[in-house]
């Protein structure tokens, strides 16, 4: 389940006498190229991340799906550590994401694409807890994008991360990760799951359909999406020019 090492080396950052803490710090010291970088958040060993540099500073790509090349139906330890290929599909790893965000509120950007060429970009203000909270995700402000605040559980509600072998969802009667697929902040199973099974066509059986990648309030519950990207950026004072 370890993330593959990239073929090309990480960019050099000469203005820091240590590894950058995150993509935002890279941006702050003048890096304007997006791509693979080695970072070292406070108290964490170094690791590679995909950075996207924008007018709002540096973002860290934490998830990418687009072709079904990587199996996302994995246990807790895999979701904690990360898996996949940084050049392709991957999950960065909950512990790595938490080491980047620390105790800060963050902005989470979610890019969705369906099979008809439609796309949606959403932004959330979130707080990610540590492993002691099962990496609970809490919305701290309303949702951005055309979809309004109905895209996820209500603001203020904290939703733990769940996998088939560590059931932390908000349903007492079932294990969302088992009845759906992959690991996710499942809540009551029905809102979204961007780590579900990759389907190239819509399965006929509902039981299989439920296991796909979906975002209920965009294309509808259980519509299997073609591609997703998730990015995160800790909130601080805006990045220095």
């Amino acid at each position: 389940p370890e993330m593959a090492q990239p073929v090309d080396p990480a960019h050099n950052v000469s203005r820091l006498h240590r590894l950058p803490r995150d993509c935002q710090e890279l941006f702050q010291v003048g890096e304007r190229q997006s791509g693979l970088f080695e970072i070292q958040p406070q108290g964490s060993p170094p690791f590679l991340v995909n950075c996207k540099m924008t007018s709002d500073g540096g973002w860290t790509v934490i998830q990418r799906r687009h072709d079904g090349s990587v199996d996302f139906n994995r246990p807790w330890e895999a979701y904690k550590a990360g898996f996949g290929d940084p050049h392709g599909e991957f999950w960065l790893g909950l512990e790595k994401v938490h080491s980047i965000t620390g105790d800060r509120n963050s902005r989470l950007a979610v890019q969705l694409r369906d099979w008809d060429g439609n796309a949606e970009l959403l932004q959330f203000s979130v707080h990610l807890g540590g492993e002691d909270t099962a990496y609970s995700l809490q919305l701290t402000a309303p949702v951005a994008g055309q979809l309004g605040a109905t895209t996820v559980p209500p603001s203020g509600l904290s939703v733990p991360f769940s996998t088939w072998d560590q059931d932390h969802d908000l349903r007492r009667d079932k294990n969302c990760a088992k009845s759906l697929s992959g690991g996710w902040w499942f809540g009551t199973c029905s809102h979204s799951n961007l780590n579900g099974q990759y389907f190239r066509s819509i399965p006929q059986q509902r039981q299989k359909l439920k296991k796909g990648i979906f975002w209920k309030t965009w294309r509808g519950r259980y519509y299997p999406l073609q591609a997703t990207t998730m990015l995160i950026q800790p909130m601080a004072a805006e990045a220095a020019s």
Epitope: D8, S34, T54, S55, L121, A144, E238
Partner: antibody, heavy 118, light 107 residues
Framework: EVQLVDSGGGLVQPGRSLKLSCAAS????????MAWVRQIPTKGLEWVAS????????YYRDSVKGRFTISRDNAKNTQYLQMDSLRSEDTATYYC???????????WGQGVMVTVSS | DIQMTQSPSFLSASVGDRVTINCKAS??????LNWYQQKLGEAPKRLIY???TLQTGIPSRFSGSGSGTDYTLTISSLQPEDFATYFC?????????FGPGTTLELK
């Protein structure tokens, strides 16, 4: 529906000033970076300036640094480009563009012509 | 700065033709490449972003491909409304740079 409406262009003498405006609607303006891009017939499209979603950070191409100021008023859903000490080489069509960052410029205003000539 | 080159600069084609326009970056741009269409007197309109994602409302005859430094826009069957100028934009390096454009005209 996302809409960006540019205004404020015109004919101005070298060394004088002009202020462009871009009124945005159909999306949560305060969540998006914004930019100005200009088009010079002989040089094609070139980025001029960008501003972060909150307005705290601004970025400029070297040739306009110290002369142009990009700003925004999130309460009015409007971004601006204050152009001072204008030069003949600033003559162009100026477009306001929305910049989600992750996907590059997506929506553009209709553009305004700025002509710097004596 | 990343330099973008486009080929060809001019292209003459007929309705129904399949055409390809190429964009080359001076370094790897990690698939952060957009394509825009611009008609005379109008603002650029985004067709494709991040190499191959079709902008909502754009016909499926437009498609994009590529990786590293080389990218292609393909129009599978030219329609009368497709005669215009096409630009690429790299946004791997903030704030991005545009290609010089390809003018597609009726043969």
């Amino acid at each position: 529906e996302v809409q960006l409406v540019d205004s404020g262009g015109g004919l101005v003498q070298p060394g004088r000033s002009l202020k462009l405006s871009c009124a945005a609607s159909g999306f949560t303006f305060s969540n998006y970076g914004m930019a100005w891009v200009r088009q010079i017939p002989t040089k094609g499209l070139e980025w001029v300036a960008s501003i972060s979603s909150g307005g705290g950070n601004t970025y400029y191409r070297d040739s306009v640094k110290g002369r142009f100021t990009i700003s925004r008023d999130n309460a009015k859903n409007t971004q601006y480009l204050q152009m001072d000490s204008l030069r003949s080489e600033d003559t162009a069509t100026y477009y306001c563009a929305r910049d989600p960052g992750i996907t590059g410029f997506d929506y553009w205003g209709q553009g305004v012509m700025v002509t710097v000539s004596s | 700065d990343i330099q973008m080159t486009q080929s060809p600069s001019f292209l003459s084609a007929s309705v129904g033709d399949r055409v390809t326009i190429n964009c080359k970056a001076s370094q790897n741009i990690n698939k952060y490449l957009n394509w825009y269409q611009q008609k005379l007197g109008e603002a650029p309109k985004r067709l494709i972003y991040n190499t191959n994602t079709l902008q909502t409302g754009i016909p499926s005859r437009f498609s994009g491909s590529g990786s590293g430094t080389d990218y292609t826009l393909t129009i599978s069957s030219l329609q009368p409304e497709d005669f215009a100028t096409y630009f690429c934009l790299q946004h791997n390096s903030f704030p991005g740079t545009f290609g010089p454009g390809t003018t597609l005209e009726l043969k």
